[in-house]
């Protein structure tokens, strides 16, 4: 039962994270939560950083600045892969949840 619950939590978290990405950066509250998660967990996107390409409100050469290894204003514009966290947040935060929930 515990494993089923854990998988359900992961699935919900994945869906919720992707939903929040769709609202980025239009919704300030959503943006600040996603930025905080990406910066704190050193991750970018749901599965990986390329998820941000699919977000209509984000230009194709951009990830949120919170994805950058060294966060500065505008660092996510025309980003270089070596300058950003490439790992996805669902897996990274999911690992933390599995240990702590």
């Amino acid at each position: 039962a515990g494993y089923v619950f854990r998988d359900k939590v992961m699935s919900e978290f994945n869906n919720n994270f992707r939903q929040q990405m769709e609202n980025y950066p239009k919704n300030n509250h959503t943006a600040s939560i996603l930025d905080r998660m990406q910066a704190d967990f050193k991750c970018c996107g749901a599965a990986n950083y390329t998820d941000w390409e699919k977000i209509p409100s984000m230009s194709k050469n951009r990830v949120p600045d919170s994805c950058c290894i060294n966060v500065t204003v505008g660092c996510g514009i025309n980003f270089n892969e070596k300058a950003i966290h490439k790992e996805g947040c669902v897996e990274k935060i999911g690992g933390w949840l599995r240990k702590n929930v």
Epitope: E53, S59, N61, N78, F79, N80, E81
Partner: antibody, heavy 119, light 108 residues
């Protein structure tokens, strides 16, 4: 020193194919995005395509989408452009170009290779 | 796509002159603007990146300015080696990278 050397250009008939190669040396290849940029005779510069460090991201100009394919081999320090369905307006010098990204500009260019599409 | 418009298209000047080329973007591009010099039969060479930063090895007589939509490239005292074609280029919205149409600098 940084070197980018293109090859594979030449004369081809409309509808034909060519594969351009670019051999790079003198820098850590995987630290950079790479681009193909072309220049028709007597004309300005036109961006064609780029590929990310790992090859995960690829984009193309509308004028070549569906006909050209960019790829890279990080083990061989090489960049490629497969060009199919070539048209007369693809005639140009094709440059292999290093891209540090952010606001740094295209800092190193190859010498270029001429592609001529004519019957 | 962001359009880049250079002016003038061509320019005649003499050695020692101060020359300014302008580049206008169709929308704000912050400082994501670069300048290149190209001589006949050669590949372009990066002069200025990030609107105002001098690329390593480029003479200090070249300078860049501007932000947002309006940018300038200035050559403080023209030298014989400076007669060439100059292009501006934006990388703020990429793809596609877009270039200006070029400014041909000729000897008067």
């Amino acid at each position: 020193q940084v070197q980018l050397v293109e090859s594979g250009g030449g004369l081809v008939k409309p509808g034909g194919s060519l594969r351009l190669s670019c051999a790079v040396s003198g820098f850590t290849y995987t630290d950079y995005f790479m681009n193909w940029i072309r220049q028709a005779p007597g004309k300005g510069l036109e961006w064609v395509s780029y590929i990310s460090n790992s090859g995960a991201i690829k984009y193309y100009a509308d004028s070549v989408k569906g006909r050209f394919t960019i790829s890279r081999d990080n083990a061989k320090n090489s960049l490629y452009l497969q060009m199919n369905g070539l048209r007369a307006d693809d005639t140009a010098v094709y440059y292999c170009v290093r891209d540090p990204r952010s606001y740094y500009g295209f800092d190193y260019w190859g010498q270029g290779t001429l592609v001529t599409v004519s019957s | 796509d962001i359009q880049m418009t250079q002016s003038p298209s061509s320019l005649s000047a003499s050695v020692g002159d101060r020359v300014t080329i302008t580049c206008r973007a169709s929308q704000s591009i912050s400082n994501f603007l670069n300048w290149y010099q190209q001589k006949p039969g050669k590949a372009p060479r990066l002069l200025i990146y990030g609107a105002s930063n001098l690329q390593s090895g480029v003479p200090s007589r070249f300078s860049g300015g501007g932000s947002g939509t309006d940018f300038t490239l200035t050559i403080s005292s023209l030298q014989p080696a400076d007669f060439a074609t100059y292009y501006c280029q934006q990388s703020f919205s990429n793809p596609p990278v877009t270039f200006g149409q070029g400014t041909r600098l000729e000897i008067n």
